[in-house]
């Protein structure tokens, strides 16, 4: 009778996480009597599968009864494939023998791979807002595919963005992989509504590609712009001063009113009109009681933007009967502490 | 249903010869090591003889050149030809089934006695 | 020749005891060990194959175990029917051999 062959007939077979995996492995014998074993990799350092003589191994499953005694077939079944599964398999014969088992006879092994899906790409912003003009970076993570191959793409608003770099890890071969990817993006004032999308393509995805999306709005700071304008009145001893604060985001604001470097009134804005590209607007108004000034006042609208340095606008009010309606504005963007007086530097 | 069944034993004078039948059914007999099994009276279980799938077969020393072991696939019989038998001989003999993969005994017929007497 | 011993020879005990007997081979043997139960005027019973791994249809209470040189076959709690006498086998290689048997009688 011829001498035994161990036939592993797949050089490779490719399993998706989660799924069973089956290994084929056929005898042309039974001689000589002894168990089959299956091993993962080769050498001193492989480990046991599946033991026909004894041992418990809940994942595996014989493919073919192996109680019969005409069976050749000692195909294996592996429930539950995860990428740590990956790696050649060996269907081996073994003698009966006596301290140890002594291997007869190996097939020649039978690679499985683990196609394993990405995890749902996470992208993450600047941890500090950025005013429009500035670049801030943008990085997207995925993780545990396999096999390494993989394409990821950048989006802003549907446009495909070109400054970024990307890195998958390890480098060499390994059960699972990682991607990592930072993008750069130049923020501009209409970025309130805008969107960044990493996209990540991959064989497990049968074309239907991963998105991770970021808000530019959680990334941008857009600071105001300050308007201070005095309003006619019927009466003549009142004056009626407005501050228009525009286009600014996000929302948090407060305002602080000064009558020649004095603070008059401190408020929070609330109520905010939202423009159409996301940002707001807010008017605050002083009522000035023109009888309680023998001079000219200044007026000064400061503005704390999104726990920025204030930036403020003044207005000089002039109590002239003959002028009531006229007057010149000043704007200063320095840091003026509430109860600073006009032209302090800050 | 899987049975081994014995026959062709009795009573022999030293010196005479038997032939043992075991009759499988159940299972191809040919795709099992056999094996015969003896107790004398009141003694233990003795190892006999086999024959493997090949055909290989393997003997006991002191019944060594005096026992034959053979099968006929066609039948699907095992038999065990005794030549020279002694006193010692006396004794239930058994035939065994070896397991699939280790050849452990799994299935056991009910065994046939063999009286070697003058 | 592979010798296997085994002890005691025979063992009282009552029915609901947990009983051992041991088996020692001259020289490892790997782990095919087997064990067999056999009561007066009948065939043997094969029980457990590779020291520990028990036949189809043997119950649970009958346990193997060891590996080399030294095996046990434990009855977890006997009942009237496992009183019988039972051998210990080494089939590593031929010759196969026995243990000369342990009788389990009734106390």
């Known amino acids: 009778e011829d001498e035994l062959q161990v036939i592993q007939p797949e050089k490779s077979v490719s399993v998706a996480a989660g799924e069973s995996a089956t290994l084929r492995c056929a005898m042309t014998s039974l001689i000589p009597v002894g168990p089959i074993m299956w091993f993962r990799g080769a050498g001193a350092g492989r480990e046991l599968i599946y033991n026909q003589k004894e041992g418990h191994f809940p994942r595996v499953t014989t493919v073919s009864e192996l109680t019969k005694r005409n069976n050749l077939d000692f195909s294996i079944s592996i429930s539950n494939i995860t990428p740590a599964d990956a790696g050649t398999y060996y269907c081996v014969k073994f003698r009966k023998g006596s301290p140890d088992d002594v291997e007869f006879k190996s097939g020649a092994g039978t690679e499985l791979s683990v196609r394993a899906k990405p995890s749902a790409p996470v992208v993450s912003g600047p941890a500090v807002r950025a005013t429009p003009e500035h670049t801030v970076s943008f990085t997207c993570e995925s993780h545990g595919f396999s096999p390494r191959d993989i394409t990821l793409k950048w989006f802003k608003n549907g446009n495909e963005l070109s400054d970024f770099q990307t890195n998958v890890d390890p480098a060499g071969d390994s059960v699972s992989y990682s991607i990592h990817s930072t993008a750069r993006v130049v923020l501009t004032r209409g970025d309130v509504h805008s969107q960044v999308i990493c996209e990540i393509a991959h064989i497990t995805l049968q074309g239907d590609p991963l998105r991770g999306t970021a808000n530019l709005s959680e990334a941008i700071r857009v600071p105001p712009t300050l308007e201070v304008t005095q309003q006619p009145m019927r009466a003549e001893n009142q004056a009626n001063v407005t501050c228009q604060v525009s286009n600014f985001y996000p929302r948090g604001l407060q305002l602080t009113w000064l009558e020649n470097g004095n603070v008059s009134r401190t408020e929070t804005a609330s109520t905010l009109i939202e423009n159409k590209d996301g940002t707001y607007n807010w008017m605050s108004w002083l009522l000035v009681n023109t009888c309680a000034h023998r001079d000219d006042v200044v007026l000064t609208c400061q503005v704390e933007h999104d726990g920025q340095q204030a930036v403020s606008k003044s207005y000089a009010l002039e109590i002239s009967a003959h002028q009531k309606e006229h007057g010149s504005d000043i704007t200063h963007e320095a840091a003026l502490a509430p109860t600073a007086p006009l032209g302090g530097s800050g | 249903e899987v049975q081994l069944v014995e026959s062709g034993g009795g009573l022999v004078q030293p010196g005479g010869s038997l032939r043992l039948s075991c009759a499988a059914s159940?299972?191809?007999?040919?795709?099992?090591?056999m094996h015969w099994v003896r107790q004398a009276p009141g003694k233990g279980l003795e190892w006999v003889s086999a024959?493997?799938?090949?055909?290989?077969?393997y003997y006991t020393g002191s019944v060594k050149g005096r026992f034959t072991i053979s099968r006929e696939n066609a039948k699907n019989s095992l038999y065990l030809q005794m030549n020279s038998l002694r006193a010692e001989d006396t004794a239930v003999y058994y035939c065994?089934?070896?397991?699939?993969?280790?050849?452990?005994?799994?299935?056991w017929g009910q065994g046939t006695m063999v009286t070697v007497s003058s | 020749d592979i010798q296997m011993t085994q002890s005691p020879s025979s063992l009282s005990a009552s029915v609901g005891d947990r009983v051992t007997i041991t088996c020692r081979a001259s020289?490892?043997?790997?782990?095919?060990a087997a064990w067999f139960q056999q009561k007066p005027g009948k065939a043997p019973k094969s029980l457990i194959y590779?020291?520990?791994s028990l036949h189809s249809g043997v119950p649970s209470k009958f346990s193997g175990s060891g590996s080399g040189t030294d095996f046990t076959l434990t009855i977890s709690s006997l009942q009237p029917e496992d009183f019988a006498t039972y051998y210990c086998?080494?089939?590593?290689?031929?010759?196969?051999?026995f243990g000369q048997g342990t009788k389990l009688e009734i106390k």
């Open positions: 065994v089934r070896g397991g699939v993969w280790d050849d452990a005994f799994d299935i």
């Open positions: 159940g299972f191809t007999l040919s795709s099992y090591d």
């Open positions: 024959i493997g799938t090949a055909g290989d077969t």
């Open positions: 020289q490892g043997i790997n782990n095919y």
């Open positions: 590779t020291a520990s």
């Open positions: 086998q080494q089939y590593v290689s031929y010759p196969y051999t």
